[in-house]
């Protein structure tokens, strides 16, 4: 089930996926003067089997001003810092794809992708949220949101986090322990597919993991 | 409960436009992409085209295009499929279909569009 | 474009019969979907990521394939089987031309 809304806006913070689950899609944009390619893909999604996860489908952009012609899909280092960002921007650990059943990484950048990202969620999936330079991480729980099911509804869990205006940057995700917050942890309920499992997977994965580039818009 | 409600059917003469509408209820209408098929009396499926109702994003089938214009209104969650300069071979029943990422999930009821002089 | 090719168009078969309809895409794809439709009804997704089942879907249903070959099989077929089933590429958003199960 895909989540109806996006995850909270925090003031001052950005918000990350460590691993996407199953069925999530991301929406194959272009930045301006671009465009998909002609019968091409309308989104990437992510799907598999129990023992390996990918994203199916492939993002290709192409000059609007040129006919049938199709760019490499290959990011060279120079599109790449073309996306709307953070200043964090040390890329992501890859992830060995077994330790993570059911889940895909952060897909690749492809050429001339849109500034910022639309993905669409599924329940169960887990977001950490981090404060932008300049701000400075007050916890008082968990710094993530979960999409959970309640009643045939979705909705997302509220972080635990407040960005204060300091001029000092906190870790990601959490340089400091969390406390256990009802609130922020997926409680097992048959009706919203979330499990101790995920939470644990995902929360481990974090702590092993350097900061992700992150985007500023999740849809 | 999801819903995919379509206009009803309409006979064209060649030449002419015709505007089939679909409106969505019981999800977030902005968030799936929805797409336009057709299928001609005892012919195969046809995509023509679809749309992502959040920031208007649209894509067309080669065939279709230049003919077919994909639009959304989002307050009244309502999509909507114009096919231009009509001829005999576009008499088809006309779907509406919502995208899960996996498959078509909800298709409306179909539209049936004939055109004769 | 990518196009998929059925086969047969049409099968006459009996029930309890086993049937096997095939789907050829004329570039090798990741997965393949199946949907049933049924006279004067919409489309029912049928079988997704080529071997899953949708929901709702008699477990007599089951998909297979890989690269441009894929198979939808029905182990035993019901009179409630019978319709027109169509594969479809995610991807580029063809369809096959159809394949109608009548029932002898």
């Known amino acids: 089930e895909l989540c109806d809304d996006d995850p909270p806006e925090i003031p001052h913070a950005t918000f990350k996926a460590m691993a996407y689950k199953e069925g999530t899609m991301l929406n194959c944009e272009c930045k301006r003067g671009f465009r998909r390619i002609k019968s091409g893909s309308l989104y990437m999604l992510c799907t598999g089997n129990s023992s390996h996860s990918s994203w199916d489908n492939q993002c290709q952009c192409t000059s609007s001003a040129t006919r049938n012609t199709t760019k490499q899909v290959t990011p060279q280092p120079e599109e790449q810092k073309e996306r709307k960002t953070t200043e964090m921007q040390s890329p992501m650990q890859p992830v060995d794809q077994a330790s993570l059943p059911g889940h895909c990484r952060e897909p690749p950048p492809w050429e001339n992708e849109a500034t910022e990202r639309i993905y669409h969620f599924v329940v169960g999936q887990m977001v950490y949220y981090q404060c932008v330079q300049g701000y400075r991480a007050l916890h008082r729980g968990p710094a993530e949101s979960v999409c959970k099911m309640t009643h045939g509804k979705t909705r997302w869990t509220q972080p635990q986090l407040i960005c204060t205006g300091e001029m000092e940057t906190s870790q990601f995700p959490g340089e400091e322990k969390p406390q256990a917050s009802p609130e922020g942890r997926p409680e097992s309920e048959t009706s919203c597919l979330v499990t101790t499992t995920d939470f644990q997977i995902q929360t481990e994965m974090a702590a092993t993991m350097e900061t992700s580039i992150f985007t500023t818009e999740y849809q | 409960q999801v819903q995919l409600v379509q206009s009803g059917a309409e006979v064209k003469k060649p030449g002419a436009s015709v505007k089939v509408s679909c409106k969505a209820s019981?999800?977030?209408?902005?968030?799936?992409?929805m797409h336009w098929v057709r299928q001609p009396p005892g012919q195969r499926l046809e995509w023509m085209g679809a749309i992502y109702p959040g920031n208007s994003d649209t894509s067309y089938s080669q065939k279709f295009e230049g003919r077919v214009t994909i639009t959304a209104d989002t307050s009244a969650s309502t999509a909507y499929m114009e096919l231009s300069s009509l001829r005999s071979e576009d008499t088809a029943v006309y779907y509406c279909?919502?995208?899960?990422?996996?498959?078509?999930?909800?298709w409306g009821q179909g539209t049936t569009v004939t055109v004769s002089s | 474009q990518i196009v998929s090719t059925q086969s047969p168009d049409t099968q006459s078969v009996t029930p309890k019969e086993k049937v096997t309809i095939t789907c050829r895409a004329s570039s090798s794809r990741s997965y393949m979907q199946w949907y049933q439709q049924k006279p004067d009804q919409s489309p029912k997704r049928w079988i997704y990521?080529?071997?899953k089942s949708a929901s709702g879907v008699p477990s007599r249903f089951s998909g297979s394939g890989s690269g441009t070959d894929y198979t939808l099989t029905i182990n035993s077929l019901e009179a409630e089987d019978a319709a027109t089933y169509y594969c479809h590429q995610r991807s580029s958003y063809t369809f096959g031309q159809g394949t109608k199960l009548e029932i002898k």
């Open positions: 279909s919502r995208d899960y990422g996996y498959y078509f999930d909800f």
């Open positions: 990521d080529t071997s």
């Open positions: 019981g999800y977030s209408f902005t968030r799936y992409w």
